[in-house]
């Protein structure tokens, strides 16, 4: 016997109490997939999440975090406070990165600065709490009488100035 | 340190309400929501609704006819009233913050155990 | 309503043994889950949210993990103090579900 709740499309669950009729998802369910026997319930964004998409009769609502966080987690299930620049989150709160390391993003932890001569490179730009050192040539390079066939790269332009 | 305590009474008549105060400390009630859940005697937990920061307030459907959560942000205080109380209401009811970081819930209140008797 | 299954109502386990309590979700949620311990008459305490994600202060002998409908709460290493109850929660759609909880046993 052919099983009709194949024909069932997207949006749609087959309805056992109604000899298989293909029903419309109720409110605030959907399937995204056709032949589904049941509709499943829409994710509701509270609290510290705010709506990103509603949901529709075939896809679920996405949700992210409100201002001054940011997502975690599998399809945004978790939201973290920003921090500044420069700064990283500890148990504690936001706190400055040590010296010798930065952070140049609202998230994430302080990472060390490069090491330029583990490169054979010298510093260039020293680093900041919010930007890493930029490496210029090699101390040998810029002896007397060294000539380069290229000019030394350009201190790269920050994405951002920090907050 | 972050702190509920809760107030509220032990007994109450079938056909009466319930009325319960969750009183916060180390922690602001305009940055935080906090929730109600309850647990029958020998049995597990269930939400009964909650009062987010701004005031607005989301309810358990199966409660939503009898069930009021209200806040005074100046004293720190949650109110929590339910009506139409019958024995099957006997439970130990929880006042809890919500997570900043998710719907969950990392403090909780000591409870209030209450018996619906007549 | 999103029923969340504690299949297992009761787990005996002995200090410094490894434990699993399962939890399985009606629908997919994704990793919308957080995991509570709750010591004989003492009111529930949080340890895990977004599926895998320790609450501050929570020994790291607690790891959550899983996604979609089926989610795990394993001990590590199991302490006497660990005698207690563990309920998982969903927290994708309202309203607000819970399993019925695990208790574990120290022999």
């Known amino acids: 016997l052919q099983d009709l709740c194949s024909n069932c499309p997207a949006g749609t669950f087959c309805d056992n109490n109604r000899s298989q009729i293909c029903s419309p998802c109720p409110p605030n369910s959907f399937s995204s997939a056709g032949g589904q026997r049941t509709c499943d319930i829409c994710r509701q964004c509270k609290g510290v999440f705010k709506t990103r998409k509603e949901c529709s009769s075939t896809s679920n609502a996405e949700c992210d975090c409100i201002s001054g966080y940011h997502c975690l987690g599998a399809e945004c299930s978790m939201c973290e406070q920003d921090c500044k620049q420069g700064q990283e989150l500890t148990k504690k709160g936001c706190k400055d990165c040590c010296f010798g390391t930065f952070n140049d993003q609202k998230r994430g932890i302080c990472r060390p600065w490069t090491n330029c001569s583990l490169d054979g490179k010298s510093v260039l730009v020293n680093g900041t709490k919010e930007r890493d050192v930029v490496c210029g040539p090699s101390p040998a390079d810029l002896s007397p009488g060294a000539s380069s066939a290229t000019p030394p790269a350009p201190a790269r332009e920050p994405g951002h100035s920090p907050q | 340190q972050v702190q509920l305590k809760q107030s509220g009474p032990g007994l109450v008549q079938p056909s009466q309400s319930l009325s319960i105060t969750c009183t916060v400390s180390g922690f602001s009630l305009t940055t935080y929501g906090v929730h109600w859940v309850r647990q029958p005697p020998g049995k597990g937990l269930e939400w009964l609704g909650v009062i987010w920061s701004d005031g607005n307030t989301d309810y358990n459907d199966a409660f939503i006819s009898r069930l009021s959560i209200t806040k005074d942000n100046s004293t720190s205080q949650v109110f929590f009233k339910m009506n139409g109380l019958q024995a099957d209401d006997t439970a130990i009811y929880y006042c809890?913050?919500?997570?900043?970081?998710?719907?969950?819930?990392?403090?909780w209140g000591q409870g209030t155990t209450l018996t619906v008797s007549s | 309503d999103i029923v969340m299954t504690q299949s297992q109502k009761f787990m005996s386990t002995s200090v410094g043994d490894r434990v699993s309590v399962t939890c399985k979700a009606s629908?997919?949620?994704?990793?919308?889950v957080a995991w509570y311990q709750q010591r004989p008459g003492q009111s529930p305490k949080a340890l895990i949210c977004s599926a895998s994600y320790r609450y501050s202060g929570v020994p790291d002998r607690f790891t959550g993990s899983g996604s979609g409908t089926d989610f795990t709460l394993t001990i590590s290493n199991v302490q006497s103090e660990d005698l207690a109850e563990y309920f998982c929660q969903q927290y994708n759609s309202y309203p607000l579900t819970f399993g019925s909880g695990t208790k574990l046993e120290i022999k």
């Open positions: 809890a913050r919500n997570s900043i970081t998710s719907v969950s819930f990392d403090c």
């Open positions: 629908q997919n949620v994704g990793t919308t």
